[in-house]
Interface confidence: low
Amino acid sequence: KLTIESTPFNVAEGKEVLLLVHNLPQHLFGYSWYKGERVDGNRQIIGYVIGTQQATPGPAYSGREIIYPNASLLIQNIIQNDTGFYTLHVIKSDLVNEEATGQFRVYPELPKPSISSNNSKPVEDKDAVAFTCEPETQDATYLWWVNNQSLPVSPRLQLSNGNRTLTLFNVTRNDTASYKCETQNPVSARRSDSVILNVLYGPDAPTISPLNTSYRSGENLNLSCHAASNPPAQYSWFVNGTFQQSTQELFIPNITVNNSGSYTCQAHNSDTGLNRTTVTTITVYAEPPKPFITSNNSNPVEDEDAVALTCEPEIQNTTYLWWVNNQSLPVSPRLQLSNDNRTLTLLSVTRNDVGPYECGIQNELSVDHSDPVILNVLYGPDDPTISPSYTYYRPGVNLSLSCHAASNPPAQYSWLIDGNIQQHTQELFISNITEKNSGLYTCQANNSASGHSRTTVKTITVSAELPKPSISSNNSKPVEDKDAVAFTCEPEAQNTTYLWWVNGQSLPVSPRLQLSNGNRTLTLFNVTRNDARAYVCGIQNSVSANRSDPVTLDVLYGPDTPIISPPDSSYLSGANLNLSCHSASNPSPQYSWRINGIPQQHTQVLFIAKITPNNNGTYACFVSNLATGRNNSIVKSITVSASGTSPGLSAGA
């Protein structure tokens, strides 16, 4: 198919373009070029007849066109108006027509752009700046660069007017940068000179240095003031409100106590019209003052608050020292000293951090100590404890319960019986109790400062008859030779005797058995499998006696070294090999076999029918107890003799 290719497609003004013909048919009569998308005689550029090899200009011929024998058309010194479509009309020898259309676009060579601005000296946080890339050029793309980087993404940056205008809203000092614009079209690209944005800002709040505010008599006072500002700020100093001088630095030699007071630095920006001031209070001491401790938190809460203790006053070139409980500071990750040692921070205070704390200022002759400071750490209440610990009482006695919970400030206590409030006291006294006084006794401790409350509940049973006791254990499945077990006879009762039996017998004498807690607790140290017995506890008083149900101790043990049976190690060929492995263990172990190191099966019995000498070798039984985490094994050598030879008999016997 006949096609036209424009080389190049995008043409710069003044350059040339070649309309290159592809698939031109053979045996032509001639061809003609037209401006536009169709054959229009009024817009013919040039015609060419093969036979005469002559070109004839048409109405649209400009004198800049050259036609080639291959039908391609060269247009030189391109102008803007040349943009558009071009149609080739081919007449073949058989007078059949064929047409093809091509096109190109003409773009101007771009001039070097420049940037215009609507505000040469914008004020920070107040003004907007609009940069416009000049000149406005048709079919041009506009790009912007900030410090030779493409535009950052920012809600304060907005492109408009076909990207020709870059607006910076609410300019900041950070917008002070080099801005360039670039114009591009398909045939050229030009970049402007850079424009530096000069943002007026400040002054910020001035800073006075050095920071120390305490001086000794006779020293020189040299204060410097600085405030970020564009243009640079103008500075003024005031002492106790009275103007001193318009300089950035204030110098007073050989100061005295009379130089104490408020020192104000004022920074002024003449372009923004803004003023900012900073005041520092200077104290001049006639001699080193006695230090004192200030705290940022007089009532810190335990495990919540940090406390910063600061040694006052701040004095230049001074060494600060600290003591806690009349000792130098202990090493602790919760104790932190500031760089100048003036501030001691206690992170996450505890009730043990009360102190006392002292700080000291070291001078040439001695160390001046502050008065001690005690921290009032608020804590608790902890879980209250109810005493005595008895839960069983006989009718007719007096019930006297006392409640205590560690707390600062001291806890306020309330007693509830079966959920009903009784009284707001630390002690609860009920005389001449009866069975009706049985119930749930709750002590509630409340810390009014922290707002925290904690409760403890105790079951009180009033009965002439002792209840049937029960045994609690701290370890239901102890491991042999490793664990200890403590049995406790419940409940705890007043004026009660506790007794123990093992397998129906009184306790044997053994260094591994220990009674404690008024015989209420029986401890077995380093339990063995022989301790797996029935344990019973009993309680008795002058009125009644009772025994618990037995508790059988389940001791985990083993596996012991396994035994392989039968013990035979020599077999005749053709016999059946039936080996059984057994190991004492609780719970029962898992068994596995290996022959000559090769795993076989996970069974207790290994059976091989009609063995041959090939079955000679080492037979290992492995046992494993998952509960104790222990393993064991045994190895047995098996020899298989060929039929007819009796192992162990000498020849000719």
Partner: nanobody, 116 residues
Framework: QLQLVESGGGLVQAGGSLRLSCAAS????????MAWFRQAPGKQRELVAA???????NYADFVKGRFTISADNAKNTLYLQMNSLKPEDTAVYYC??????????WGQGTQVTVSS
């Protein structure tokens, strides 16, 4: 005009990687820069990464450190290497010139789906 054909999308698990390609007919850097965009369902198209003809790159904060844009001028091809993908990266991804002049000529895009 610049013709753009994106490819390389697909379904990937969170934490996985994909590499997108964009074949351009005509000069890849016709206006001196190219970019990748994405559009999630019900959301506006957003700029993900851009590269200039000089090779300098810019990234949106939400992909910084995970995505890398590159170009092969000889092949007129733009790439986007996407690592440590997240479910919120699910979108249709397009390449184009970064500025509005090129936005009349969108390609068909390539779908990226990140499952959790």
């Amino acid at each position: 005009q610049l013709q753009l054909v994106e490819s390389g999308g697909g379904l990937v698990q969170a934490g996985g990687s994909l590499r997108l390609s964009c074949a351009a007919s005509g000069s890849l850097f016709r206006i001196n820069a190219m970019a990748w965009f994405r559009q999630a369902p019900g959301k506006q198209r957003e700029l993900v990464a851009a590269i200039t003809s000089a090779g300098s790159t810019n990234y949106a904060d939400f992909v910084k450190g995970r995505f890398t844009i590159s170009a092969d001028n000889a092949k007129n091809t733009l790439y986007l290497q996407m690592n440590s993908l997240k479910p919120e990266d699910t979108a249709v991804y397009y390449c184009n010139t970064p500025w509005p002049v090129g936005r009349d000529y969108w390609g068909q895009g390539t779908q990226v789906t990140v499952s959790s």
